[in-house]
């Protein structure tokens, strides 16, 4: 094949090599960019910055090598459009630092930075951590900070992410109230901060105020939907990102729903209860308090993390006709009470038959040798006998 005269030449089926001295000053408009998986750049002293726009359209890129060039700055979002990047070699350039944001979101198997005049400060604490934890092949490089010494020796006691404190109202919050939250941010080198409110949707009208180091957030005209929803304050500095989530408890009265009994492994009378604070529950059977036992008990389903409503069952273990009747669930909290009732019929009463129709019945004693504790059916000699164990 004839030698390639261009600044960049194909390499394999989806690679590109740019090695002609000083031919590039940016990575715009690389040929066949959208299908590239490998890009090798060398001896490009005019290539000094790597920005977001440089790698746009390189969505398939997996290996990027820029070596022995003039790279001085890599933007924190430079690799936003290359999420599949797994190998990054930036050795022998002029990099003094590299932000933690640059590699965030990438699954780098290899990161090579040797031969750069790195400068140790808290901004490289993340890289020191990679070295400590054996990530990305960093320990083998024995990285040095120019004029200082090994990265491994950099003091890091003061290199912390921001500290966040979110103040929420002490008093109870009612539906329709306005709530003021304040996020206090402390730490060195604070860069950005804000609120994450994605869970809130229609739970309140949101107004943000203030800026670093004290951010305000007003949630106006709150609804009960706000309960269990995360309101998150975040802040970033050159070391990393911190987040703190809080929830605002909006008080509202108890409510309850009952559904028709269903037969599963045991019988279940399904219910849903809601309210803030969480209501206390009591069951009535035919108007009298139902004392729960190992045969009749309340069981809750795993609660959803982002809502107050609780679903569950009144479980009945092999109920008989004596369990037929009216079931009422009472729910109460300091803001109100509610009840719901449902008729449940688990088994027809075997004694409710027409006396004109003689049906011989024998009662079998419970087998005293049984260890299960459940009634045991005994076979009777009478061919038409019905054996009933009374529970």
């Amino acid at each position: 094949a004839a030698p390639c005269p261009d600044a960049c030449c194909p390499h394999g089926s989806s690679g590109l090599r740019c090695t002609r001295d000083g031919a590039l000053d940016s990575l715009h408009h690389l040929p066949g960019a959208e299908n590239l998986t490998e890009l090798y750049i060398e001896n490009q002293q005019h290539l000094q910055h790597l920005e977001l726009r440089d790698l746009r359209g390189l969505g398939e890129l997996r290996n990027l090598t820029i070596v022995k060039s003039g790279l001085r700055f890599v933007a924190p979002d430079a690799f936003h459009f290359t999420p599949r990047l797994s190998r990054l070699n930036l050795s022998f350039n002029a990099l003094e630092s590299l932000s933690w944001k640059t590699v965030q979101g990438l699954s780098l198997q290899e990161l090579v930075l040797s031969g750069n005049p790195l400068h140790c400060s808290c901004a490289l604490r993340w890289l020191q951590r990679w070295e400590e934890e054996g990530l990305g092949g960093v320990p083998e490089q024995k990285l040095q900070c120019h004029g200082q010494g090994p990265l491994a020796h950099m003091p890091n006691a003061s290199c912390g992410v921001p500290t966040l404190k979110v103040q929420v109202p002490n008093a109870s919050v009612d539906v329709g109230d306005d709530v003021l939250l304040r996020c206090q941010v402390e730490g060195r080198g604070l860069e950005q901060a804000g609120w994450i409110l994605t869970e809130l949707e229609q739970s309140a009208t949101v107004m943000k105020s203030g800026g670093l180091p004290s951010l305000g957030l007003t949630l106006a005209n709150v609804t009960s939907d706000l309960n269990r929803k995360n309101v998150t304050c975040w802040a970033e500095n050159d070391v990393g990102r911190a987040e703190v989530s809080v929830q605002v408890n909006v008080s509202f009265p108890a409510s309850v729903q009952l559904h028709t009994a269903v037969e599963m492994h045991h019988w279940c009378i399904p219910f849903s209860v809601d309210g803030q604070p969480a209501p206390s529950l009591r069951w009535l059977f035919n108007g009298s308090v139902l004392n729960e036992t190992s045969f009749i008990f309340t069981e809750f389903l795993e609660p959803a993390a982002n809502e107050t409503v609780r679903h569950g069952c009144l479980r009945l273990n092999q109920p008989t006709h004596v369990n037929n009747g009216n079931y009422t669930l009472l729910a109460a909290n300091p803001f109100g009470q509610a009840s719901a009732s449902i008729m449940a019929a688990f088994m027809d009463n075997p004694f409710e038959f027409n006396p004109e129709d003689p049906i011989p019945v024998s009662f079998s004693p419970v087998d005293t040798n049984s260890t299960s504790g459940d009634p045991v059916e005994k076979k009777d000699e009478t061919p038409f006998g019905v054996s009933v164990a009374v529970g």
């Epitope: 003094e96 005049p117 400068h119 400060s121 808290c122 901004a123 040095q144 120019h146 004029g147 200082q148 010494g149 090994p150 020796h153 950099m154 003091p155 006691a157 003061s158 290199c159 060195r188 080198g189 604070l190 500095n237």
Partner: antibody
């Protein structure tokens, strides 16, 4: 103990060059970065640049690029700072100092070399 | 370059006094150094990364601060402490020094 001993005072004419030496003893010379700092009469401290004796890597303050050359001789554990095109404002005491990475600071300083630029 | 501003530029104090010198960086830095210099002598390291005492430095010296604001405190001034004090940052290139604070005898 760790010591840095600098060469003696120099008087130079404007436009000339001066080469100040800094002889290290009491530690492994090639392991630690050597820095140069100067102090004009009655003024504060000003960083000039640094050299890594292990491989001669250097870094200079922008102000001194093109006029300062940092070198070293590992056989004698000596670092050198040469300043060319001297002008009167280069009159100062020049210090060498070691950056001790174990505790991350300039721990040992030379006694200083006075360079006077005068016509 | 990060500018380092020391205050006061000079102060008069008596033996036994508590003395505080402040150093402000033009942008947030990772840590700070303090040096003591006497006339005709090389600077002597006092405090490294903000609050650690240099070798042989008496415990009456202490350093504190974070971000942009830092302090050197001498809890009880001694005769040998009359000197000029410099702060220095090395958060980014080049390392820069404060203008100095001269502590004189009242």
């Amino acid at each position: 103990q760790v010591q840095l001993v600098q060469s003696g005072a120099e008087v130079k004419k404007p436009g000339a060059s001066v080469k100040v030496s800094c002889k290290a003893s009491g530690y492994t010379f090639t392991t630690y970065w050597m820095h140069w700092v100067r102090q004009a009469p009655g003024q504060g401290l000003e960083w000039i640049g640094t050299i890594y004796p292990g491989n001669s890597d250097t870094s200079l303050a922008q102000k001194f690029q093109g006029r300062v050359t940092l070198t070293r001789d590992t056989s004698t554990s000596t670092a050198y700072m040469e300043l060319s095109s001297l002008r009167s404002e280069d009159t100062a005491v020049y210090y060498c100092t070691r950056f001790y990475f174990e505790d991350w600071y300039f721990d040992v300083w030379g006694q200083g070399t006075t360079v006077t630029v005068s016509s | 370059d990060i500018q380092m501003t020391q205050s006061p530029s000079s102060l008069s104090a008596s033996v036994g006094d508590r003395v505080t010198i402040t150093c402000r960086a033009s942008s947030s830095i990772s840590w700070l150094y303090w040096f003591q210099q006497k006339p005709g002598k090389a600077p002597k390291p006092l405090i490294y990364y903000t609050s650690s005492l240099g070798s042989g430095v008496p415990s009456r010296f202490s350093g504190s601060g974070s971000g942009t604001d830092y302090t050197l405190t001498i809890s009880s001034l001694q005769p040998e402490d009359f000197a000029t004090y410099y702060c220095q940052q090395w958060h980014s290139y080049p390392p820069t020094f404060g203008g100095g604070t001269k502590v004189e005898i009242k």
